[in-house]
């Protein structure tokens, strides 16, 4: 498919001249950021961004790659080096420590320097590092965490927790020896480490005692509370704040977000991770865009500003399953949330960053025709005389041998939301990838986001832009009209 | 391996504070660029950049990812959308048209708008688009093309040629019907379309009549001249310029680059593509770094400045073979050339861009330990109880079934320069990938390189920065001390 207008050199020359004009107009703001938003696409490497752009464009009846994601409109881009101190290819715990606390840690640890060792409780104390969200709170800002995963998952936990094991969601997941040594589960830390104004995502079961039925799935024992200590953490959290509200479904969320008496909001919409966007019950569960909007409504009441973490956390899960359909539709919802946040905030006073914690071994090749489905087949056949998809994985569960051979695939099969793209190496779960990821920036001090940086730089840019520790002497003018 | 100093949060906080300090000091230059250099890593997607960084670092006895490539030091980064008008995943011809001429074209065409159709000679005329190199020449600058491929290959040809088929290297490759219609082979266009001051790379055989023995392989008929028209294009080129010199080996190149009487230099060091850096005979063939240095010595004599295209063209070839060792060692030599050019030029007057034309379906995963070989094995075994490498391809010739199963691999095998990493789909040649690639920029107007852009933007930034057509009214101050 060749669009007629694109055959004319004028089309490209005009477009580039406009882009140049926009580039020339870019003026680095010398003001401080009142608000900070970090959008974290978990596992959203550059190949995921491009494939999602094409898919989002095609959903709007365009050919695809010529369209813009919301994040594409951010004026500044850097590359972020994602390795952890101990691994070339990191996990979401060590990376969360980097972009939220400004310090690199070890694989599967959270909120701890690399002096801490995975799973060794006694290496926790003294090695805690403090997140930018925590520092924002200390500076009088309101703070929030929004995710499509459990709110106790590795990425959001980087904003508030310190743990040598990212899997210690509730005390039931913590070995008795570690509990005796004083190591706390992540859910406990969620409500006790700091005062978080807005908490939205999944993860109900980690907050309630074993045997507590889940409100949405009351007959499913596996979905009920998991805690061994008998604590109802939601109740404890509600008791801390007069204006606190707990919600567990979309209707309650929308009501609470518009209620001026609500000062603190916890919404936990699933026992574990939230459902994939394509599986979401839109009556019961809010979308990431809706959660983001709700969070912004509450947080933006604070005249001192806010810090908000928004995670598209299940992009990563789709990739681990080698189901690109899931990963890419999650990325589109993540981008929709970015777009909505842009409408609800001003780049005059809000520094917004979009990035990924790491990438995936996910590729998009095979010379497909422009406008062809991103989930489709490459032109021609492979060496084994069978069709193959343009999307593939280096490793993962999409490896199937039928009669000692690679299975053939049709366009209809590959377009299915359940289809697992093939991989070179058979694994139960496809792995992360170690290449640099993009950082997109907009707003005050966004111009500092440049070049190739360590992932830790992200936290430092946020802290500096908002004059938080250790950059309180930031020497940035407050935005005209900022109230305190 | 956990470096002790990295266990201390101060290590990361200090490092990030320094990076912030550097970011704050960045001042967009308001001057024009006297010189333009575009470094093109053919097939150098972000995964290739990261893997090469680790390899280069490890060759210097470091752990790897914490080190810097020369391109990493460039202060500005953008992402470039590489699709061609007709394909989601492009080739090196259509992309060369984009980044060198500023207009997108169709797959496998060069220097033509998308109104031209692949292989249809009669769609050439009237659809030619003019490269920035050509415009630089018209503005009185010296110009050069340096590549490790044939100088008639798709990427360098984008600087001077217009052809509906990138494979028309010499007239022997052009169908008789197309020749009768007036379509010229790329080698002919190299010497006749415009005056190029420096031409360095491979591609001897396309310049000489059939039956002309090659000077390096005189007894090898397959390496000799291929031309059917009986023309000696080197002789024709030499006759055009009094100070022209032709060289075919490293010794002659080094002599010619230091000879003030040489105004034009053509060096063709292999009959076809130059040898991979790991196979190069260092007595006979210059490295990419040496060719770059030679080009800069000649071009920098012009007080009006120069345009130079430098291509690490065989990164792409290594990937097509699914031989990451070759691709990554080519990338390192490419980076060495960037480093050397940086030493020989000033960012006060030289805009340097580094980018790729497209990526490859190449991934780096599997959670390897920090400091482990980039060519090594992932920890643990796959689901088939066999080892697997951290580097893998989505498709390509590394797919082998032994007895109906994926072959096992040892660290020693995977570290071999000949080893082909495994792929999900068996192809004769691994394919390009369609995700965005990075653009690194340094020098006057480098700050314009920002955000997510069409690949065409690159040509326009160069033209604008040097006040070339269509931006002669660029309104940029010449650099203090610029001579004309």
């Amino acid at each position: 498919i060749i669009p007629v207008e694109e055959e004319n050199p004028d089309f490209w020359n005009r477009q580039a001249a406009e882009a140049l004009g926009a580039a020339k107009k870019l003026q680095p703001a010398q003001t401080a950021a009142k608000n900070l938003i970090i959008f974290l696409g978990d596992g959203m490497g550059v190949s995921t961004v491009t494939a999602a752009r094409i898919l989002k464009g095609q959903k709007k009846d365009k050919l695809g790659p010529e369209t813009f994601l919301a994040m594409d409109r951010f004026p500044y881009v850097a590359l972020s080096k994602t390795y952890s101190v101990d691994k070339h290819v990191p996990d979401s715990g060590a990376t969360a420590t980097a972009y939220l606390c400004g310090v690199k840690g070890n694989f599967q640890t959270i909120g701890l320097s690399a002096a801490a060792r995975f799973n060794q409780c006694n290496t926790t104390r003294g090695n805690e590092v403090i997140s930018v969200m925590n520092r924002a709170k200390k500076a009088g800002k309101s703070v929030g965490v929004v995710t499509t995963t459990r709110v106790q998952h590795a990425s959001p936990a980087g904003a508030y927790a310190h743990t040598v094991n990212r899997n210690w969601y509730s005390d039931a997941d913590v070995p008795a020896s570690a509990r005796q040594e004083g190591c706390q589960d992540i859910a406990t830390q969620l409500i006790s480490n700091m005062d978080i104004d807005v908490i939205l995502g999944g993860g109900r079961k980690y907050m309630f005692p074993m045997g507590t039925p889940d409100p949405e799935y009351p007959d499913d024992y596996s979905q009920g509370g998991t805690r061994l200590d008998g604590k109802n953490l939601v109740q404890e959290w509600l008791a801390k704040h007069q204006g606190a509200r707990y919600v567990w479904n979309r209707t309650e969320l929308l009501q609470a977000s518009l209620d001026p008496s609500v000062t603190h909001l916890m919404g936990l919409f699933e026992p574990g991770d939230m459902k994939y966007e394509i599986h979401r019950d839109s009556t019961l569960d809010p979308s990431l865009m809706e959660m983001t909007e709700a969070a912004l409504l509450l947080l933006s009441r604070n005249p001192r500003g806010f810090f908000l973490f928004v995670e598209g956390g299940r992009i990563d899960h789709g990739h681990h399953e080698s189901r690109a359909y899931r990963a890419l539709t999650e990325t589109i919802m993540f981008d929709d949330a970015i777009e909505r946040a842009g409408q609800l905030t001003s780049e005059e006073d809000t520094l917004s960053l979009v990035t990924a914690d790491h990438s995936h071994v996910f590729s998009f090749g095979g010379y497909p025709l422009r406008g062809s489905s991103i989930f489709g087949l490459a032109p021609g056949k492979a060496r084994d005389r069978k069709a193959y998809t343009v999307l593939l994985y280096g490793n993962g569960p999409g490896y199937v041998l039928k009669d000692g051979a690679r299975p053939d695939v049709t366009e209809s099969e590959s377009g299915s939301p359940e289809y697992r793209q093939q991989s070179a190496v058979p694994l139960d779960g496809e792995t992360h990838a170690g290449e640099d990821v993009a950082v997109f920036a907009r707003g005050p001090q966004a111009h500092l986001v440049h070049g190739v940086q360590e992932q830790t730089f992200i936290a430092h840019v946020m802290a500096f832009a908002a004059c938080l520790e250790p950059y309180t002497a930031c020497d940035l003018a407050p935005r005209a009209g900022t109230t305190d | 391996i956990i470096p002790v100093e990295e266990e201390n949060p101060d290590f990361w906080n200090r490092q990030a504070a320094e990076a912030l300090g550097a970011a704050k000091k960045l001042q967009p230059a308001q001057t024009a660029a006297k010189n333009l250099i575009i470094f093109l890593g053919d097939g150098m997607g972000v995964s290739t950049v990261t893997a090469a960084r680790i390899l280069k670092g490890q060759k210097k006895d470091k752990l790897g990812p914490e080190t810097f490539l020369a391109m990493d030091r460039f202060p500005y980064v953008a992402l470039s959308k590489t699709y061609s008008v007709d394909k989601h995943v492009p080739d090196s011809g259509a992309t060369a048209t984009a980044y060198l001429c500023g207009v997108k074209g169709n797959f496998q065409t060069i220097g033509l708008s998308a109104a031209a159709r692949f292989n249809q000679c009669n769609t050439t005329r009237g659809n030619e688009v003019i490269s920035v190199m050509n415009r630089a020449k018209k503005a009185g600058k010296s110009v050069g093309v340096v590549t490790t491929t044939r100088v008639q290959h798709a990427s360098p040809a984008g600087a001077y040629a217009h052809t509906v088929n990138r494979n028309w290297y010499s007239d022997a490759d052009v169908p008789a019907s197309a020749r009768q219609e007036g379509c010229q082979d790329i080698a002919t266009q190299l010497i006749s379309n415009m005056d190029i001051d420096v031409i360095l790379g491979g591609g001897r055989k396309y310049m000489f009549p059939m039956g002309t023995p090659d000077p390096e392989y005189p007894d090898d008929y397959s390496q000799g001249g291929t031309r059917l028209d009986g023309k000696n294009l080197v002789q024709e080129w030499l006759a055009k310029h009094q100070g022209a010199r032709y060289v075919w080996n490293r010794t002659e190149l080094l002599q010619a680059s230091l000879d003030p009487s040489v105004t034009h230099l053509m060096g063709l060091f292999e009959p076809g593509d130059m040898k991979y850096e790991i196979h190069r005979d260092s007595t006979l063939d210059p490295s990419l770094m040496e060719m770059t240095e030679a080009a800069l010595l000649l071009l920098s004599r012009n007080p009006r400045g120069f345009f130079l295209f430098v291509e690490g063209g065989r990164i792409d070839h290594g990937h097509h073979e699914s031989r990451a060792y070759r691709a990554l060692t080519e990338t390192i030599m490419f980076d060495d050339a960037i480093e050397r050019a940086g030493q020989l030029t000033s960012e006060e007057d030289t805009l340097s861009l580094v980018t790729a034309d497209h990526s490859h379906v190449f991934s780096f995963g599997g959670y390897p330990l920090r400091g482990s070989s980039i060519f090594g094995l992932a920890p643990g075994k796959a689901r088939d109880r066999k080892a697997y490498t951290v580097l893998l391809y989505g498709n390509g010739p590394g797919y082998v079934l032994k007895d109906g199963a994926r072959p096992d691999v040892t660290e020693s095998e995977s570290g071999s320069p000949e080893y082909r990493q495994q792929s999900a789909v068996p192809l004769d040649g691994e394919t390009h990938a369609g995700e965005d690639v990075a653009v690194f920029a340094r020098g006057p107007q480098a700050h314009l390189v920002h955000g997510v852009q069409e690949q065409t933007f690159i040509a326009h930034v160069m033209a604008f920065a040097a006040c070339l057509e269509p931006y002669t009214a660029c309104d940029l101050a010449p650099r203090a001390g610029t001579t004309d």
Epitope: - | T283, E321, P397, E418, D428
Partner: antibody, heavy 123, light 106 residues
């Protein structure tokens, strides 16, 4: 002109050791992969060992039948290639050739060969 | 490791005959196959590399073809001086020779 000259062959008892040498001239020795190949009486050609070039760190590879017994090495200052053969067996009796690779079409074909040196393992 | 199966092991033909020798690899060798001529008391001589490229000085009656796992050496018109043993060599991944084909005149 590329020249390869093997030496060091001769009669040796089983279980003993022998070192073969190959002197190279006419090319930049450090830039090329070098191999040893043998041909036993009445048998076919058998590739034994490879040592790569400077650019690839002079890494080595062996065929399974000689791994652990034979060692390939090079002295670049002398333009010399060596094959150290330990624990020799009667089946190691063969003409041993030194060969240089050429990188045609990015392959590493064994393009240049010496004339060979005979090794006889017998008690 | 890649195995090479060469056939036939010996072959008797008349002068002027078309002669074909085949080599089958245990896996795809991506056209990285060479053919050598070996005459007793001499070093093996490279005749063809990368499947079909003739070495300098090799008569044009020799040709090579193939792809994937299957490769062929053809002598279009056998000459007396062609009497020798021919070996294929894969060099895609390290090196493996075929068992050889002894060519004789009838």
């Amino acid at each position: 002109e590329v020249q390869l000259v093997e030496s060091g062959g001769g009669l040796v008892q089983p279980g003993r050791s022998l070192r073969l040498s190959c002197t190279a001239s006419g090319f930049t020795f450090t830039d090329y992969y070098m191999s040893w190949v043998r041909q036993a009486p009445g048998k076919g050609l058998e590739w034994l060992a490879l040592i790569r070039n400077k650019a690839t760190g002079y890494t080595t590879e062996y065929t399974a039948s000689v791994k652990g017994r034979f060692t390939i090495s090079r002295d670049n200052s002398k333009n010399s290639l060596y094959l150290q053969m330990n624990s020799l067996k009667t089946e190691d009796t063969a003409v041993y050739y030194c060969a240089r690779a050429s990188f045609y079409y990015d392959g590493k074909v064994l393009a240049y060969w010496g004339q060979g040196t005979l090794v006889t393992v017998s008690s | 490791d890649t195995q090479m199966t060469q056939s036939p092991s010996s072959l008797s033909a008349s002068v002027g005959d078309r002669v074909t020798i085949t080599c089958k690899a245990s896996q795809d060798i991506n056209k990285y196959i060479a053919w050598f001529q070996y005459k007793t008391g001499k070093a093996p001589k490279l005749f063809i590399h990368y499947t079909s490229t003739l070495q300098p000085g090799v008569p044009s009656r020799f040709s090579g073809s193939g792809s994937g796992r299957d490769y062929t050496l053809t002598i279009s018109s056998l000459q007396p001086e062609d009497i020798a043993t021919y070996y294929c060599l894969q060099y895609d991944n390290l090196y493996t020779f075929g068992q050889g084909t002894k060519l004789e005149i009838k």
